[in-house]
């Protein structure tokens, strides 16, 4: 048994580290292997994680882990039985994908106006919460090529649109990301879409 | 409450031996590392020894290894010092301290202190 | 072994001034923790500030910690009467925990 893709990990920069590998063949994750990881920190304790399968030969393990601070530096052992299969270390401050957002709301009751909110993925004491921006992604149901991107480069999770940037009469979805510049961190995750009917008011055309 | 009570402090000549008991209440003790620090009359802080939660590792400041033994009852929840050869300059007052993981190293609940004196 | 230096040795500042508390490190402890305490005359010293810059729970905002590498700051905002103590900075790395010799706030 042997290792063709050594772990890779990323960070939620909160309480979870999602481990990554793959075997050079077909392997019960959970029965045949265990993760080990520990803070390198003085007189802290080795903790074991048991992986998941993730396709035939992947393996997916969750570390879980009491807050992270960009000191934090661990040890990483991937055991097979008594066989250390690799040894690393994994530093959570230089490998972070944020949380996604949540509760996306389009409030379409504001005028002509499309007032769009969510939720920040993560606490006020956690360092991240004030250091996440997004984007926001809107598109229609009924036309593949009316597909934008609205980057949120402020700290408030919000946006307002005119609706009149849209079309009226049809159905659009939106969906929320976000990332954090300070970490050079990954994009997160989309958050789930939410739908709406977009109408508005056409202006009065003279001619 | 979460509290941390020492005892077995006293006067002892130089040479001599003392274990110092520190009774944890209010949290599980296997689940924290524990540490003993120190305070000589006037001076600072210095860290004496520590040990991890499960008692697999310890750890002592220079000046006191080999000398002390630090040792943990957690069922009884009870964290010990094992103090012996002493020296003048261990008189101090001896702090029971806890750190919790989630502080990194930060001492969050402190004994109110035992005060031990070596002196012939 | 890592040394802690505080300066100064002792602050003399009025109540609602700003006080800033410095602490030194000998070598790079990135990969380490710093914390602050604070402890006033016949009690045991109390956690302020952990992981360079997080505040311990109760701790008023007042107080803040920043630094990286060698160069560590506690600063109080605005001083209060009962903010008048001795403070002390702590490393807690891999190897080793070591504290500084501690800075006296007094009153002006």
């Known amino acids: 048994m042997k290792v063709l893709q050594e772990p890779t990990c990323v960070s939620d920069y909160m309480s979870i580290s999602t481990c990554e590998w793959k075997m050079n063949g077909p392997t019960n994750c959970s029965t045949e292997l265990r993760l080990l990881y520990q803070l390198v920190f003085l007189l802290s304790e080795a903790h074991t994680c048991i992986p998941e399968n993730n396709g035939g030969a992947g393996c997916v393990c969750h570390l879980l882990m009491d807050d992270v601070v960009s000191a934090d530096n661990y040890t990483l052992d991937l055991w097979a039985g008594q066989q250390l299969l690799w040894k690393g270390s994994f530093k959570p401050s230089e490998h972070v994908k944020p949380r996604a957002p949540g509760n996306l709301t389009v409030h379409t009751n504001v005028s002509d106006t499309l007032l769009l909110t969510w939720s920040n993925p993560y606490p006020p004491d956690n360092y991240l919460y004030n250091h996440l921006t997004y984007a926001v992604n809107i598109w229609s149901e009924n036309d593949p090529a009316d597909f934008r991107i609205y980057n949120v480069t402020y700290l408030e999770p919000s946006l307002r649109i005119a609706a009149s940037t849209l079309k009226s009469g049809i159905s659009y979805r939106a969906r929320v990301r976000a990332w954090a510049q300070c970490y050079n961190t990954t994009w997160s995750e989309w958050s789930p879409s939410t739908k709406w009917h977009n109408s508005y008011r056409e202006p009065f055309e003279q001619h | 409450e979460v509290q941390l009570l020492e005892s077995g402090g006293g006067l002892v000549q130089p040479g001599g031996s003392l274990r110092l008991s520190c009774a944890a209440s209010?949290?599980?003790?296997?689940?924290?590392?524990m540490h003993w620090v120190r305070q000589a009359p006037g001076k600072g802080l210095e860290y004496v020894s520590g040990i991890s939660g499960n008692s697999a590792s310890t750890y002592y400041a220079n000046s006191v290894k080999g000398r002390f033994t630090i040792s943990r009852d957690n069922p009884k929840n009870t964290l010990f010092l094992q103090m012996s050869s002493l020296r003048a300059e261990d008189t101090a007052v001896y702090y029971c301290?806890?750190?919790?993981?989630?502080?990194?190293?930060?001492?969050?609940?402190w004994g109110q202190g035992t005060t031990v004196t070596v002196s012939s | 072994e890592i040394v802690l230096t505080q300066s100064p040795g002792t602050l003399s500042l009025s109540p609602g001034e700003r006080a800033t508390l410095s602490c030194r490190a000998s070598?790079?402890?990135?990969?380490?923790?710093l914390a602050w305490y604070q402890q006033k005359p016949g009690q045991a010293p109390r956690l302020l500030i952990y992981g360079t810059s997080r505040r311990a729970t109760g701790i008023p905002d007042r107080f803040s910690g920043s630094g990286s590498g060698t160069d560590f700051t506690l600063t109080i905002s605005r001083l209060e009467p009962e903010d008048f103590a001795v403070y002390y900075c702590?490393?807690?790395?891999?190897?080793?925990?070591?504290f500084g010799q501690g800075t006296k706030l007094e009153i002006k």
């Open positions: 702590q490393l807690y790395g891999a190897t080793s925990v070591t």
């Open positions: 301290v806890r750190v919790k993981l989630k502080y990194r190293g930060g001492m969050d609940v």
């Open positions: 209010g949290f599980t003790l296997s689940s924290y590392a």
């Open positions: 070598q790079d402890i990135s990969s380490a923790y």
